[in-house]
């Protein structure tokens, strides 16, 4: 058993049918010695008396808010949560496996630049009695500071019969140098509590590996005289690290017909302009990627050919 | 990345082309190592990230773009002496460059070159003959060092009398390649920045 926060405790259980469970001793936080009784949750049934209460915690029915009283007055509370270990592996019931970029990916994180700011998000089908708390650091043995905000519900979508909820959090490394070469990964730890179930999820990454630039901005077309060709131009996104000559991007320019089946013409360039043939009803899209470190491409920025 | 890449024209900052070749070569070598050594811990998540140049060179600090010198987190031990030799820059651009930066890059390359050559000698003794260092990568390191044109005493190749542990050598190769790829990215950024200056 360990303390998650004041008066909230996590009991770790080897989870299998007929498991013996864990013996837990609760102590009433009071100078009183006599006339103390214990109850669980809203029940008035007295579970025991005395300053300490010994219980065998086996299942969720044994978890909850234990309260000690004296003469009708509440003295203190202890909330017991359960953390299930199933055959040597901590349970992952609360969050959905996003399966991207690989199986068992519960937390996904992205950064728009090298400033040390990043966003993580996760998915769940649970809509109520759910709380998250997020901590982060650079490295684990001698951790350096990363500050995270509160996790917030950022999207809701319907998937088949189920509703899916997306939560996200923004974090910022306390003293980040955009040009630094990372040797210690960022660690992100999310504590999830659903009713009386506790779970924790972690992700470990280098900022350089989670970079995904914003799409190029100010995408414009300039027709070339007496030609089907157009000059496409764009700019680096505002959120990208500066100076751009140091943090350079490379670009992919795509001409896509109205039909998805039509052949796509693609050009790769390090410049912020390109000359392409603009077909009728086609659209021109441009996306960006770090020129020197192949992390994710940005989403496409698009303009119609007409 | 199999993209069409424009070849820089000869008027460009001469080291830019070499540094781009370096990054391509080390990235290819790392990809080859990951595939060949699939049963070894060779991915970024599995290896310890060690920097053999730590406390010996200061490339990131020495080559920091002027725009980032206002960022206190970037200023660990920045020294600001300006370039006095090295042939990478045309003379009119010399004043924009710090000697420490290019010499630091040169020292990095020299240290990695020695490590890679020592390692290759060990890998050649492996009865499995599983993996060797790409000669192209070693040649590209050499070309960039020559383009930098710094005079520095040669570091003797380390020789080891004891029987090599090939498992450890292959893991060390992965660690080295990961670190060298990261340094090659920094070198490319620096060259691109200097080229634009």
């Amino acid at each position: 058993i360990w303390e998650l926060k004041k008066d909230v405790y996590v009991v770790e259980l080897d989870w299998y049918p007929d498991a013996p469970g864990e013996m837990v001793v609760l102590t009433c936080d009071t100078p009183e010695e006599d006339g103390i009784t214990w109850t669980l949750d809203q029940s008035s049934e007295v579970l025991g008396s005395g300053k300490t209460l010994t219980i065998q915690v086996k299942e969720f029915g044994d978890a909850g808010q234990y309260t000690c009283h004296k003469g009708g007055e509440v003295l203190s509370h202890s909330l017991l949560l359960l953390h299930k270990k199933e055959d040597g592996i901590w349970s992952t019931d609360i969050l959905k496996d996003q399966k991207e970029p690989k199986n068992k990916t519960f937390l996904r994180c992205e950064a728009k630049n090298y400033s040390g700011r990043f966003t993580c998000w996760w998915l769940t089908t649970i809509s109520t009695d759910l709380t998250f708390s997020v901590k982060s650091s650079r490295g684990s043995s001698d951790p350096q500071g990363v500050t995270c905000g509160a996790a917030t519900l950022s999207a809701e979508r319907v998937r088949g019969d189920n509703k899916e909820y997306e939560y996200s959090v923004e974090c910022q490394e306390d003293s980040a140098c955009p040009a630094a070469e990372e040797s210690l990964p960022i660690e992100v730890m999310v504590d999830a509590v659903h009713k009386l179930k506790y779970e924790n999820y972690t992700s470990s990454f280098f900022i350089r590996d989670i970079i995904k630039p914003d799409p190029p901005k100010n995408l414009q077309l300039k027709p070339l005289k007496n030609s089907r060709q157009v000059e496409v131009s764009w700019e680096y996104p505002d959120t990208w690290s500066t100076p751009h000559s140091y943090f350079s991007l490379t670009f992919c320019v795509q001409v896509q017909g109205k039909s998805k089946r039509e052949k796509k013409d693609r050009v790769f360039t390090d410049k912020t302009s390109a000359t392409v043939i603009c077909r009728k009803n086609a659209s021109i899209s441009v996306r960006a990627q770090d020129r020197y470190y192949s992390s994710s491409w940005s989403e496409w920025a698009s303009v119609p050919c007409s | 990345r199999n993209l069409p890449v424009a070849t820089p024209d000869p008027g460009m900052f001469p080291c830019l082309h070499h540094s781009q070749n370096l990054l391509r070569a080390v990235s290819n070598m790392l990809q080859k190592a990951r595939q060949t050594l699939e049963f070894y811990p060779c991915t970024s998540e599995e290896i310890d990230h060690e920097d053999i140049t730590k406390d010996k060179t200061s490339t990131v600090e020495a080559c920091l773009p002027l725009e980032l010198t206002k960022n206190e987190s970037c200023l660990n031990s920045r020294e600001t002496s300006f370039i006095t030799n090295g042939s990478c820059l045309a003379s009119r651009k010399t004043s924009f460059m710090m000697a420490l930066c290019l010499s630091s890059i040169y020292e990095d390359l020299k240290m990695y070159q020695v490590e890679f050559k020592t390692m290759n000698a060990k890998l050649l003794m492996d009865p499995k003959r599983q993996i060797f260092l790409d000669q192209n990568m070693l040649a590209v390191i050499d070309e960039l060092m020559q383009a930098l044109n710094f005079n520095s005493e040669t570091v003797p190749q380390k020789s080891s009398l004891e029987e090599p542990d090939f498992y450890k050598t292959k893991i060390k190769l992965c660690i080295l390649l990961h670190a060298f790829r990261i340094r090659a990215v920094t070198i490319d950024r620096v060259m691109s920045y200097l080229n634009a200056s």
Partner: antibody, heavy 115, light 112 residues
């Protein structure tokens, strides 16, 4: 004590269907994940499928994906394996088992796919 | 498609020490716990070892398990006639959990 009693096995022609059941008692069935494991005659153990305690997630071996469906009825304390498009290579003893560091197995039920 | 490899058979005389190896990789045994099962003819498998080296109550202490890196082993110290059976190791793969990965199985024969 924990008990898993299996039923539903038998002889079936290729291409036909069969449903296996596993009745649980002696524990809170709705709190635990469950597996199906099979063993072809004279061969080793092969995992078939898994279902979460609440039925929310199901996992299958590639060899049965799209043909077999694992399900559970927590109100009846019963686990099921619906097998469709059966093939000769599905001939095996099928076991249900609880998920956990200490596990309990059903007695097994023989499924024979033969024309 | 077994990824946990065991020797097909091992044998020993009563009282001898018999060991069965189970060889895997970084993503399975290297990252997860190992179990060992004993299966007597015509019966369901019985758990002998969980969590690499733990014995459930009721399992004789002549059975012991260990794990090192990407391999595990089961030792029977002082093998007895009633130990003649098939033995299977089991683990998980970190990418496909909760799918059970079973070893190829080892037939233990007690001679004499």
């Amino acid at each position: 004590q924990v008990q898993l009693v299996q039923s539903g096995g038998g002889v079936v022609q290729p291409g036909r269907s069969l449903r296996l059941s596993c009745a649980a008692s002696g524990f809170t069935f709705s709190s635990y994940g469950m597996h199906w494991v099979r063993q072809a005659p004279g061969k080793g153990l092969e995992w078939v499928a898994f279902i979460r305690y609440d039925g929310s997630n199901k996992y299958y071996a590639d060899s049965v994906k799209g043909r077999f469906t694992i399900s559970r009825d927590n109100s009846k304390n019963t686990l099921y394996l619906q097998m469709k498009s059966l093939r000769a290579e599905d001939t095996a003893v099928y076991y249900c088992k609880t998920h956990g560091s200490h596990d309990n197995w059903g007695q097994g039920t023989m499924v024979t796919v033969s024309s | 498609s077994y990824v946990l490899t065991q020797p097909p058979s091992v044998s020993g005389t009563p009282g001898q020490r018999v060991t069965i190896s189970c060889s895997g990789g970084r993503s399975n045994i290297g990252s997860n716990t190992v179990k060992w099962y004993q299966q007597l003819p015509g019966t369901a498998p019985k758990l002998l070892i969980y969590n690499n080296d733990q014995r459930p109550s009721g399992v004789p202490d002549r059975f012991s398990g260990s794990k090192s890196g990407t391999s595990a082993s089961l030792a029977i110290t002082g093998v007895q006639a009633e130990d003649e059976a098939d033995y299977y190791c089991q683990s998980y793969d970190r990418g496909t959990h909760p799918a059970l990965l079973f070893g190829t199985g080892t037939k233990v024969t007690v001679l004499g």
